[in-house]
Amino acid sequence: KFSKQSWGLENEALIVRCPRQGKSSYIVDWYYSQTNKSIPTQERNRVFASGQLLKFLPAEVADSGIYTCIVRSPTFNRTGYANVTIYKKQPDCNVPDYLMYSTVSGSEKNSKIYCPTIDLYNWTAPLEWFKNCQALQGSRYKAHKSFLVIDNVMTDDAGDYTCKFIHNENGANYSVTATRSFTVKDEQGFSRFPVIRAPAHNETKEVEIGENTNLTCSACFGKGAQFLATVQWQLNGNKITDFSEPRIQQEEGQNQSFSNGLACVNTVLRIADVKEEDLLLRYDCLALNLHGLRRHTIRLSRKNPIDHQSTYC
């Protein structure tokens, strides 16, 4: 049940996370399942355990097998299994199916290809990207953080994409490669200047002091997948993250597809325990895409005490 397949190439680094969820700082013991022999934690070993991670620096074909991890506490032991397979490097350019990570699909408006498993490694930009073993060159390809963006995607951009990066461990460098297929969807979509559906511009919302309230910022950006479409709240012209008031939190944006196919995104601003000073703030709903930025402002006002209706959204 708590088992996960992991694979890598000989002479490359491979890092595997314990498939059993724990929390950081808990003791995690790793064992070779077949022999029940404990895996060392000393970093001088080629294969060593480091908390929730098992590191092969570098991996060898003989490392293939099942590894047991146990997240330990005096009252809970959580056991997981990592099924590791290390393959010989292919002499030719062909990447066999068993080395492929999940396929991703893109379109003219949305062509991000994430480098699989990279978050487990200590790497520094830039990533190198290859398609069918050829290094990607030209202004259409942009390596951005842990993903590749392709401008003006066409059907012949479909294929196998390999990311290559260097993992650094205590000053030693190890190569890592990962490959996944990219397919192109033919999508008749379009992008347009953002339209904010809520709130109305210069809207005022009545709230009760001491109660909780939610403000929803919702905007539509066109039809089909959008390359860039974000909504966010600002307080008095500042980002929420720059505004050190833990009572006021912004939820992550959520994509919404409507029956008419519009690509819309919303984000909720949650205000706990509304205070008088919150009524003095300007709340800006910002919608941004490649066409530009639109802003709607909403303010809070104290609810008339005679009106006893609930103010929850």
């Epitope: 708590f2 059993r20 969820q21 724990g22 929390k23 700082s25 808990y26 003791i27 997240v71 330990r72 506490s73 005096p74 009252t75 809970f76 959580r78």
Partner: antibody
Framework: DVQLQQSGPGLVKPSQSLSLTCTVT?????????WNWIRQFPGNKLEWMGY???????TYNPSLKSRFSITRDTSKNQFFLQLNSVTTEDTATYYC??????????WGQGTSVTVSS | DIVLTQSPASLAVSLGQRATISCRAS??????????MHWYQQKPGQPPKLLIY???NLESGVPARFSGSGSGTDFTLNINPMEEEDAATYYC?????????FGSGTKLEIK
């Protein structure tokens, strides 16, 4: 995100049984974690009552002897508290909570239960 | 059962100042270099909320002004600087053995 929603009666007569339900959304109770019941007496003292883990195995606080049990309905993603032969001493706010490992990470909203004739 | 004794029972601290809450266990809750003590915050009408696990690890989303320390039988929760929304009751809980037990709580108010 894991969310726990509690339901059950607010008033129970002495010597009767108390039954409460905790409905979990955002996570399957058979995937992992332990699913606890905790109560808070008037005066705010908290007492851990026990848990049922993802596999259905239970662990109880010995202070509740054999009066207490936790069961589950995996098809509805719910787990239940049953406390038999209640007395006025069982008047409390009852919480369900989930445990990733050791600590109580997510809590239900609480159900206030009064034992009175 | 391991008994957890919190002190003080109540505490008033000025905004911007440090609040310190203690929790003493009747026997050690540490083993293998880890301390199995956790801290919660509870506001009226709400369930407790996890702040710190394993004595000193900040739960995700909890502000950095909260910190925990200690090992063996003596543990401390610090809030620095005290903010208005920190007025609440704070509880310690151990998971060294069954049954888990909680401290009696410390009510923190604004001076």
């Amino acid at each position: 995100d894991v969310q726990l929603q509690q339901s059950g009666p607010g008033l129970v007569k002495p010597s009767q049984s108390l039954s409460l339900t905790c409905t979990v959304t955002g996570y399957s109770i058979t995937s992992d974690y332990a699913w606890n019941w905790i109560r808070q007496f008037p005066g705010n003292k908290l007492e851990w009552m026990g848990y049922i883990d993802y596999s259905g195995s239970t662990t109880y606080n010995p202070s509740l002897k054999s009066r207490f049990s936790i069961t589950r309905d995996t098809s509805k993603n719910q787990f239940f508290l049953q406390l038999n032969s209640v007395t006025t001493e069982d008047t409390a706010t009852y919480y369900c909570a989930s445990t990733v490992i050791d600590s109580m990470d997510y809590w239900g909203q609480g159900t206030s239960v009064t034992v009175s004739s | 059962d391991i008994v957890l004794t919190q002190s003080p029972a109540s505490l008033a601290v000025s905004l911007g100042q440090r609040a310190t809450i203690s929790c003493r266990a009747s026997k050690s809750v540490s083993t293998s270099g880890h301390s199995y003590m956790h801290w919660y915050q509870q506001k009226p009408g709400q369930p407790p909320k996890l702040l710190i696990y394993l004595a000193s690890n900040l739960e995700s989303g909890v502000p950095a002004r909260f910190s925990g320390s200690g090992s063996g039988t003596d543990f401390t929760l610090n809030i620095n600087p005290m903010e208005e929304e920190d007025a609440a009751t704070y509880y310690c809980q151990h998971s060294r053995e069954f049954p888990f037990t909680f401290g009696s709580g410390t009510k923190l108010e604004i001076k």
